[in-house]
């Protein structure tokens, strides 16, 4: 009887299954859709929460202007196809034989066409712009405040390494994140600025991935920041690729 | 990138044996801990050996005494001899590479997978 076989749960991932017969009497915690047994002592993959998200029961100025290369994720939930690794793969198809390449957090970024579609290599999303508008307060938070608390939260909530949130914008009411990770910055054990973003994302829009926890509770100098809209912008190290139809559409 | 490639699966009859083996590239090998994982038709994955970089093994009661899981770090290649196959050992056979924590078991990547039917 170990201390695994107590407390045999993925604290960062609700969307697992653990049972205590791993290796040694080691806890395993197997993501739904996938089956793959995650690591609970950090995040999970975006590719791999989609994939169990898919397969769960369905019932349940400082500002900056985003380039004209960034990317909204219009399209939706879609079941993926991950990697080895559990990572996107760069060319993702639904059950009709639609293709589509992806960035590395699974948003498209290329025009949809058949199985002949050919995506190379997974481009790398290295700028991550997290766009927010909180609900009126009786005044402006203080911007150094509100800055501390915000990498506070992704360094702690989310094991997200202080170097990688870049910047906080604050322009009363909307707030601006900014997170960046190129690949050579990126070191082994290193959480992926993607996967912060989105469960961060989960978080804002009150479907918190961790196990346990209550909801995300955000307060500056304890006046609650309640967020009312979300907008995420991701730009890829190699600019996407769009037809000018869908460009002027 | 990771890439873990299996092969020798098949068709064998109950009593029978075989050897799973699985190619590994893209990471330091002599270094990982490794594992056999198989998912039969719709049941969920469970692992059914487990080896460290130094050689030590771990097994669940269901193959113990049958599976033998072992590696060759200078071909970079991790293996699994099945002997007294059963009907029920039938199902996907992938292998993993691993690790264990303090409390838990992760696989941080694996294979595609191969086919083990064990009929008569």
């Known amino acids: 009887h170990t201390a695994a076989q107590d407390n045999c749960t993925c604290p960062t991932n609700k969307m697992t299954v653990c049972s205590p017969d791993g290796p040694g009497g080691r806890c395993q915690c197997r993501a739904l859709g996938s089956g793959m047994a995650v690591d609970c002592s950090t995040l999970t993959s975006k590719c791999l929460l989609l994939k169990a998200r898919m397969s769960a029961p369905k019932n349940a100025r400082t500002l900056v202007r985003p380039s004209e290369h960034a990317l909204v994720d219009n399209d939706g939930l879609y079941d993926p196809d991950c990697d080895p690794e559990g990572r996107f793969k760069a060319r993702q198809c639904n059950q009709t034989s639609v293709c589509w390449c992806v960035n590395s957090v699974g948003v498209r970024r290329t025009d949809k066409g058949d199985l002949s579609l050919r995506c190379d290599e997974l481009v790398r999303t290295h700028h991550i712009l997290i766009d927010l508008r909180h609900r009126p307060t009786a005044g402006a938070f203080n911007h150094s405040d509100l800055d501390a608390e915000l990498r506070r939260l992704f360094r702690e909530r989310y094991r997200l390494h202080p170097k990688f949130v870049a910047a906080v914008h604050y322009e009363q009411p909307t707030i601006q994140i900014e997170l960046r990770q190129n690949t050579s910055q990126k070191a082994a054990g290193d959480v992926d600025i993607g996967d912060a973003a989105y469960y961060f994302e989960r978080d804002i829009k009150g479907e918190s991935l961790f196990q346990g926890r209550g909801g995300l509770d955000l307060r500056v100098r304890g006046e609650p920041l309640q967020v009312e809209r979300t907008l995420i912008y991701y730009l890829d190290e190699i600019p996407p690729k769009f037809s000018m139809k869908r460009l002027t559409a | 990138q990771v890439q873990l490639q299996e092969s020798g699966g098949g068709l064998v009859q109950p009593g029978g044996s075989l050897r799973l083996s699985c190619a590994a590239s893209?990471?330091?090998?002599?270094?990982?801990?490794m594992s056999w994982v198989r998912q039969a038709p719709g049941k969920g994955p469970e692992w059914v050996s487990y080896i460290t970089s130094g050689g030590t093994t771990y097994y669940p009661d269901t193959v113990k005494g049958r599976f033998t899981i072992s590696r060759d770090n200078s071909k970079n290649t991790l293996y699994l001899q099945m002997n007294s196959l059963r009907a029920e050992d039938t199902a996907v056979y992938r292998c993993a590479k691993s690790r264990l924590t303090d409390s838990h078991y992760v696989e941080d990547a694996w294979g595609q997978g191969t086919q083990v039917t064990v009929s008569s």
């Open positions: 893209g990471f330091t090998f002599s270094g990982s801990d």
